[in-house]
């Protein structure tokens, strides 16, 4: 009789995961008896897969009915494959023995897993930034085989350049994570703003994985402040606004001080958006010049998403308007908020600081 | 190591069945042939039949065709034969033995059961 | 039905000398490239056990004093040099088709 072959001949095949891979192997002989046993890896540290007489292997099936009269069919059939079936394969002869004894290997199957990579997730700054400045955006999927990948960031729309990606491991593995951090220059128009990783792998059929951030979590638009005082509203009260437009996010307290004194503090909220995804807010305070004596300085000061106060202050004129008699009455003080404002043609008798 | 352990003596009437067990362990039992042969007193082997237990095929020999049924609890790695409408010349001891090599031969044996058919 | 007839039915050799037992089958065994001949050994109160498989080839843990030979419908068991301990009862059987044995033949000491 001829001398056994152990014939396995597929070098190598691929499986996506979660199907199946059947992995061929037949032998030439009928002799010696004795049980096929499958190993992934060679050497000592090899793992068993599959005995054919003996032990539990759920996942692994013969192809062929063992018990068939003349069986030389030892192919194996690995059910829900994972990356971490990934390895060569093979298919042992052993004779019969106490314990069996090996007799002849076949060459070896590999087994590659293609994985698809996880959905990209996009994380910002931990700290908003102003327009002008640069923040760093990272992208990470993990879990994807082969190592071949492509990313690409966008920023609405528009491929940026000034990006740099990693794959890992370098070396070979049963799977493979990207991380790929972007550098992104920050306008005040980027309040709607979005940036997009997009991740190409051979797993997804060209339909690539997108993850996103909005720009909203990372910026900082400060407000621009002016105070104006408006027409009289009545004898002695004199109606000043304090005008806070163009900031982003909304968390934003106002307070009015009068010489110096805190008069009224309030908080931004509920406000309704600028077309730019900015806000604006208007106050106002009413001042009544007759409990004065002397000039009042009006401060407007604004403290924005927890950065340091900007004031913006106006000097109301008591001289310029005469007191009324009997009057105790020292200020009052209203506030609204207001979505436009409207620039007052009567602006005679403030002072810019 | 491969164990095939068989249930004990049996004496029975004529007419009567008997059925005789055979629990395996060593191995998967599920991938082996399971073949019943006996021995009477002081003569050679003779093959009943044979069992696959992944799914209950079986061939019999013509002689036990009528008579002997195989089968097999796959829960508790145990093969059966029961042989019906016994006779004295039934008298042998049963054994069981596994076909390693799917080559119908027969590579492990069990110690054998005695049935006796006496009146 | 395939027919195994063994000869000698008995025979008597002495300790270190060859013995050899004949299987002639009543139609060739030879399938697939094999020949379907298997041998045993049976002592006196125990099961056979499996000495040659597929005509020439010795099972695992048997001397290599055993050896088998023979194609098609004749074949042979060989005892290089008898020991002792070879004194049974040695059976052919043949799978070309459902198992069958042969009668036995005895095997004893001159």
């Known amino acids: 009789e001829e001398e056994l072959q152990v014939i396995q001949p597929e070098k190598s095949v691929s499986v996506a995961a979660g199907d199946s891979a059947t992995l061929n192997c037949t032998v030439t002989s009928l002799i010696p008896v004795g049980p096929i046993q499958w190993f992934r890896g060679a050497g000592p540290g090899r793992e068993l897969i599959y005995h054919q007489k003996e032990g539990h292997f759920p996942r692994v099936t013969s192809v062929s009915e063992s018990t068939k009269r003349n069986n030389m069919d030892f192919s194996i059939h690995i059910s829900n494959i994972t990356p971490a079936d990934a390895g060569t394969y093979y298919c042992v002869k052993f004779r019969k023995g106490s314990p069996d004894v090996e007799v002849k290997s076949g060459a070896g199957t590999e087994l590659s897993v293609r994985a698809k990579p996880s959905a990209p997730v996009v994380s910002g700054p931990a700290v908003r930034a102003t327009a002008e400045h640069t923040v760093s955006f990272t992208c990470e999927s993990h879990g994807f085989s082969p190592r071949d990948i492509t990313l690409k960031w966008f920023k609405n729309g528009n491929e940026l350049s000034d990006f740099q990606t990693n794959v890992d491991p370098a070396g070979k593995s049963v799977s493979y994570s990207i991380r790929s951090t972007a550098r992104v220059v920050l306008t005040r128009r980027d309040v709607h703003s979005q940036v997009i990783c997009e991740v190409a792998h051979v797993t997804l059929q060209g339909d690539p994985l997108r993850g996103t951030a909005n720009l909203s979590e990372a910026i900082r638009v400060p407000p621009f402040l002016e105070v104006t005082q408006q027409s009289m509203r009545a004898d002695n009260q004199v109606n000043v606004t304090c005008q806070v437009t163009k900031f982003y996010p909304q968390r934003l307290q106002l307070t009015w001080l009068e010489n110096g004194n805190v008069s009224r503090t309030e908080m931004a909220s509920a406000l309704p958006e600028n077309k730019d995804g900015t806000y604006n807010w208007t106050s106002w305070l009413l001042v009544n010049v007759s409990a004065h004596r002397d000039d009042v300085k009006l401060t407007c000061q604004v403290e924005h998403d927890g950065q340091p106060a900007v004031n913006k202050s106006f000097s109301v004129k008591v001289s310029a308007h005469p007191k009324e008699q009997g009057s105790n009455t020292a200020a009052e003080n209203t506030g609204t908020n207001e979505r436009d404002y409207k620039d007052d043609d009567d602006k005679h008798h403030h002072h810019h600081h | 190591q491969v164990q095939l352990v068989q249930s004990g003596a049996e004496v029975k009437k004529p007419g009567a069945s008997v059925k005789v067990s055979c629990k395996a362990s060593?191995?998967?039992?599920?991938?082996?042939?399971i073949n019943w042969v006996r021995q009477a007193p002081g003569q050679g082997l003779e093959w009943i039949a044979m069992i696959d237990p992944s799914d209950s095929e079986t061939h019999y020999n013509q002689i036990f065709k009528d008579r002997a049924t195989l089968t097999t609890d796959t829960s508790t790695s145990t093969a059966y034969m029961e042989l019906r409408s016994l006779r004295s010349d039934d008298t042998a001891v049963y054994y069981c033995a596994m076909d390693y090599g799917s080559l119908y031969a027969m590579d492990y044996w069990g110690r054998g059961t005695l049935v006796t058919v006496s009146s | 039905d395939i027919v195994l007839t063994q000869s000698p039915d008995s025979l008597a050799v002495s300790l270190g000398e060859r013995a050899t037992i004949n299987c002639r089958a009543s139609?060739?065994?030879?399938?697939?490239?094999?020949?379907?001949i298997f041998w045993y050994q049976q002592k006196p109160g125990q099961p056979p056990k499996l000495l040659i498989y597929?005509?020439?080839n010795r099972d695992s843990g048997v001397p290599d004093r055993f050896s088998g030979s023979g194609s098609g419908t004749d074949f042979t068991l060989t005892i290089s040099s008898l020991q002792a301990e070879d004194v049974a009862v040695y059976y052919c059987?043949?799978?070309?088709?459902?198992?069958?044995f042969g009668q036995g033949t005895k095997l004893e000491i001159k």
């Open positions: 139609q060739s065994v030879r399938s697939s490239g094999y020949n379907w």
């Open positions: 059987q043949e799978s070309r088709e459902l198992p069958t």
């Open positions: 060593g191995y998967t039992f599920t991938n082996y042939w």
């Open positions: 597929l005509a020439s």
